[in-house]
């Protein structure tokens, strides 16, 4: 038997993936556990094996179909269960009625690229990945730029309150190495959260022209 408190948190990427983390205070002795997804209106059901991510938490990804296929809508509710093997049978450790479009976390933006760079500014674009067409333009972004001698945590957040897949960074220092990241969030969903940050994009501003003011 397992004692202690349990936390079971899942997010839908808006297309064909539900990612779950299960935390359990009590120790599990080499027990095999899985997440089972059972939608209330659809024909599929899916299972994934929970794998340890720390001493007391496990994670897995429910792959519902091809990455860009739309497997759930706003009308769906998915019963999610954590099942752990106890001898010859499975025991339900946690359960939730999961409303996918109330619990969104999109994939990190991809394909970051420098469109144009100057001495003091840089124009960067990106793409969103595996995001549902249901959102239309109802997305927002946050971006941050890593300057020399600073940490990501110190970087000020730039907020784009609309679906704008580019940014023009201003007031940069000439001939300086920077890194840039962006993340995305739908406006929909009570428990929706930001996507992970994108992979950092490194870029360097152009040197100032010799003999000219900078």
């Amino acid at each position: 038997a397992v004692n202690g408190t349990s936390q079971f948190t899942c997010f839908y990427n808006s297309r064909a993936n539900i990612s779950c983390v299960w935390s359990q205070d009590g120790a599990l002795q080499d027990t095999s556990c899985q997440v089972h997804a059972w939608p209330d209106r659809r024909r599929w059901n899916q299972t994934c094996e929970l794998l340890p991510v720390s001493q007391a938490s496990w994670a897995c990804n429910l792959i519902l179909g091809a990455p860009d296929s739309q497997k759930l809508t706003t009308v769906d509710i998915v019963t999610l269960r954590v099942l752990c093997r106890e001898g010859v049978r499975w025991r339900v450790m946690a359960i939730q009625d999961f409303k996918p479009f109330e619990n969104l976390r999109l994939m990190a933006p991809i394909s970051l690229q420098v469109v144009h760079v100057e001495t003091h500014r840089c124009n960067i674009s990106w793409e969103i990945s595996q995001a549902s067409h249901y959102f239309e333009r109802h997305l927002e972004f946050e971006a941050r730029t890593l300057s020399p001698g600073h940490t990501w945590e110190e970087a000020p957040l730039l907020t784009l309150k609309q679906k704008q897949e580019w940014i023009c960074l201003e007031t940069l220092t000439p001939d300086t190495q920077y890194e840039f990241q962006v993340r995305v969030k739908p406006l929909q969903g009570e428990f929706t959260t930001w996507s992970p940050w994108s992979q950092p994009l490194a870029f360097r501003t152009k040197p100032a022209a010799l003999g000219k003011d900078t």
Epitope: D40, S69, V75
Partner: antibody
């Protein structure tokens, strides 16, 4: 095998109410939504709403202007659809259907005639 | 509400013909599109779910395709029992809506 068996035909006067039943068998009643769909004579299909027997949660078509109520009795695996303030254009065959990626099983239909 | 428009409204064909019925949604419904067959005095029967999934017991001559707003039901070789009315239906969002129907008649 899965079966949905509906109550018999009804004749009602305008302004009255009707309650149609749908008894399910052959599957776990509480695990699938039940929808109600109607079809006026010689016309197409109109979705009225649905109910989840496991929770009693409902969704209604706003076109019915609050005149419809769907309920279940899990002890008898029966779904009910009540339509109030009946009008002549409510004359139709009323179907219950189980939802599972489409309406995969249907009742035989209940003819409700509204006539003065 | 999402409007579903079928074409044609009626169609005459012969046994052995290949027949195509189309359904257009007024907005993107991804693949949440089902097809039904109905014969006079009977309840509809599910043929195809989620655009292309063949419901159990349905002959393989029935197939579905499409995505977004445009969908197709194809009967590869008409049989005598296929003469009926066909409806598309979206289960992308409430209220669920049906096409107006396509009546398939014997030529």
């Amino acid at each position: 095998q899965v079966q949905l068996v509906q109550s018999g035909a009804e004749v009602k006067k305008p302004g009255a109410s009707v309650k149609v039943s749908c008894k399910a068998s052959g599957y776990t009643f509480t695990s699938h939504w039940i929808s109600w769909v109607r079809q006026a004579p010689g016309q197409g299909l109109e979705w009225m709403g649905d109910i989840y027997p496991g929770s009693g949660n409902t969704n209604y078509n706003e076109k019915l202007q609050g005149r419809v109520t769907m309920t279940v009795d899990t002890s008898t695996s029966t779904a009910y659809m009540e339509l109030r303030s009946l009008r002549s254009d409510d004359t139709a065959v009323y179907y219950c259907a189980r939802e599972r990626g489409g309406f995969d099983y249907w009742g035989q239909g209940t003819l409700v005639t509204v006539s003065s | 509400d999402i409007q579903m428009t079928q074409s044609p409204s009626s169609l005459s064909a012969s046994v052995g013909d290949r027949v195509t019925i189309t359904c257009r949604a007024s907005q993107d419904i991804s693949n949440f599109l089902n097809w039904y067959q109905q014969k006079p005095g009977k309840a509809p029967k599910l043929l195809i779910y989620y655009t292309s999934g063949l419901h159990s017991g349905v002959p393989s001559r029935f197939s579905g395709s499409g995505s977004g707003t445009d969908f197709t039901l194809t009967i590869s070789s008409l049989q005598p029992e296929d003469f009926a009315t066909y409806y598309c239906q979206q289960d992308n969002n409430h209220p669920y809506t049906f096409g107006q129907g396509t009546k398939l008649e014997i030529k």
